[in-house]
């Protein structure tokens, strides 16, 4: 049995079922249109 609040995640996806979005750190904001 385990109850945890975990720690902040900062990794990108690693396995097919990691459930993580890519979240690339080098992405830049670009205004649409």
């Amino acid at each position: 049995s385990e109850t945890t609040t975990g720690t902040s995640s900062n990794s990108s996806q690693s396995t097919s079922n990691s459930g993580l979005a890519p979240n690339p750190t080098n992405a830049t904001t670009k205004a649409a249109g």
Epitope: S8, S18, P22, P24
Partner: antibody, heavy 117, light 113 residues
Amino acid sequence: DVQLKESGPALVKPTQTLTLTCTVTGYSITSGYTWHWIRQPPGKALEWMGYIQYTGSTRYNPSLKTRLTISRDTSKNQFVLTMTNMDPVDTATYFCARGTTASFDYWGQGTTVTVSS
Amino acid sequence: DIVMTQSPLSLPVTPGEPASISCRSSQSLLYSSDQKNYLTWYLQKPGQSPQLLISWASTRASGVPDRFSGSGSGTDFTLKISRVEAEDVGVYYCQQYFIYPLTFGGGTKLEIK
């Protein structure tokens, strides 16, 4: 089949703490994926709140981070949303969902929470 | 945060006719590492939770009829229904599943004329 079901109080008072539980059947929350909370104010769009990954790591929406904790009870295959200092603007339907690397593929039915004195 | 903008807000359609919903993101959703667009479509039928329709901009989820199709890349995306049926009514949401915080569009309500 994977199923998720939310449970918790329908009514909370302002300044109180909300605790909602998502019970997952058909898949172990420690085996894979991310496990999310999403909310929807009446007549409005969806807002992503945060997740706990199968590893136990968490991530929160910065707009809610100071008030939010997502934890889990692996013995019951549940993950839990705790939100402090509730306000009437937090009135919404709260959904739990499973996150893949591209989408939310399974959703709970949702539970409506009203914040009122 | 990435802003997702949908249009139109409301879409009245005659059964059997096509329908098209637009979604624009404030930032490109094309991931250079895998050349996939991390754009997802959901349908929320009245009184229900959202259900997954399309992921990676154009990949239909299991059990989704082939009258639904998704297209687009970068910042501009489209969901098309080739022939609308009565069961298609509800609110359609696009979502970026690319960068945290994950964000949704404001929704497009499809109704039958």
